[in-house]
């Protein structure tokens, strides 16, 4: 029957023996033998390995491509990848922020419910009755119609989701 060998969490089974994994920030250059320990080497500049590993190559640091609207949020190290984010006025289109899209403005008749962030687009909602938005905007919410009554005026033109009420002097005709 085959022997069952269990290695620790920072080791790997290789040809019947437990070899040490290479620590984050390094890569494998030689497997261990009965006489020698695992040989590891630091990742070169521009590379990283984030976990205990037995990989022959470190991973290349990500490049935040300016032509895709990306910029560096956090520089990579020997143990971590570069983190990209989007330029002002744009947001990431995926969890890994591989590309950016312009924030979407809320069109007239819609107000901003949630402003865009670096990872999410603007959330718009239709202006309910009694509220309006008359411009495309990344931050304006729906505003309430003017109360003509409060100003001792009368409604000359009803408001819509895109326009405010127009008030005027009360007619003297009885």
């Amino acid at each position: 029957l085959g022997q069952c060998v269990t290695c620790s969490d920072k080791q790997y089974l290789h040809d019947g023996q437990c070899c040490d994994l290479c620590q984050p920030g390094s890569r494998l250059t030689s497997h261990c033998t009965a006489l020698e320990k695992t040989q590891c080497h630091p990742c070169d500049s521009g590379e990283f390995s984030a976990q205990w590993n037995r990989e022959i190559r470190c991973h290349q640091h990500r490049h935040c491509e300016p032509n895709q609207g990306l910029r560096v949020k956090k520089e990579g190290t020997a143990e971590s990848d570069t983190v990209c984010t989007c330029k002002e006025g744009q947001h990431c289109t995926s969890k890994d922020c591989e590309a950016c899209a312009q924030h979407t403005p809320c069109i007239p008749g819609f107000g901003v419910m949630e402003m865009a962030t670096e990872t999410t687009d603007t959330v718009c909602h239709p202006c309910p009755v009694g509220f309006f938005s008359n411009q495309s905007s990344l931050f304006e919410k729906c505003y309430p119609w003017t109360s003509c009554e409060d100003k001792n005026l009368e409604v000359l033109q009803k408001g819509t989701s895109q326009t405010n009420v127009i008030c005027g002097l009360k007619s003297r005709m009885r």
């Epitope: 290789h14 494998l28 022959i56």
Partner: antibody, heavy 117, light 106 residues
Framework: EVQLVESGGGLVQPGRSLKLSCAAS????????MAWVRQAPTKGLEWVAS????????YYRDSVKGRFTVSRDNAKSTLYLQMDSLRSEDTATYYC??????????WGQGVMVTVSS | DTVLTQSPALAVSPGERVTISCRAS??????MHWYQQKPGQQPKLLIY???HLESGVPARFSGSGSGTDFTLTIDPVEADDTATYYC?????????FGGGTKLELK
């Protein structure tokens, strides 16, 4: 005894495809990174591609990226090199080699690939 | 790419000591390896990580160096050592081989 035996070479026209195989025996194939290294006639050695033990990571030299695909079948202990859009400069003896970390501790006898019209 | 420069050929007499050099265009730390290739055969690993002797390789072979300058020494040379010797680095991407040094016996 470690053995690596390549097959699938031959004469092929530019632009055509060829698939090389390497049958491995005498060691636990799924434990090792594997590679293809080539040698043009009367020339030196040139690393072509490597693949991780699980097949999850692959590495290529720039001149073959997008044209060559390295793969493996651990159940069959076989390494493959799919070569598409072949060029005359791909003419060489192709060796299958076993990685021990970052060097090559065992090599096959090699298989000749000639790209010519 | 890292360029590895080797002298193309050497001729020595059996019993002598020979040193084969390999110079890298940039530092490769100790990630340098040496192979022997006899005519019509596949390469064979001799030395790995600059100075480690591969199992089964005679102790006549030794390696030294770090950074950019590396040496393979054969002492004493035997008739069977007629071959081309290649250095290989695994520090930079892509891994590269030297052009080879052809060793001939007088």
């Amino acid at each position: 005894e470690v053995q690596l035996v390549e097959s699938g070479g031959g004469l092929v026209q530019p632009g055509r495809s060829l698939k090389l195989s390497c049958a491995a025996s005498g060691f636990t194939f799924s434990n090792y990174d594997m590679a293809w290294v080539r040698q043009a006639p009367t020339k030196g050695l040139e690393w072509v591609a490597s693949i991780s033990p699980s097949g999850g990571r692959t590495y290529y030299r720039d001149s073959v990226k997008g044209r060559f695909t390295v793969s493996r079948d651990n159940a069959k202990s076989t390494l493959y090199l799919q070569m598409d859009s072949l060029r005359s400069e791909d003419t060489a003896t192709y060796y299958c080699a076993r990685h021990d970390g970052s060097y090559f501790d065992y090599w096959g006898q090699g298989v000749m690939v000639t790209v010519s019209s | 790419d890292t360029v590895l420069t080797q002298s193309p050929a050497l001729a020595v007499s059996p019993g002598e000591r020979v040193t084969i050099s390999c110079r890298a265009s940039e530092s490769v730390s100790t990630l340098m390896h040496w192979y022997q290739q006899k005519p019509g055969q596949q390469p064979k690993l001799l030395i790995y990580l600059a100075s480690h002797l591969e199992s089964g390789v005679p102790a006549r072979f030794s390696g030294s160096g770090s950074g950019t300058d590396f040496t393979l020494t054969i002492d004493p040379v035997e008739a069977d050592d007629t071959a081309t010797y290649y250095c290989q680095e695994s520090w930079n991407d892509p891994w590269t081989f030297g052009g080879g040094t052809k060793l001939e016996l007088k």
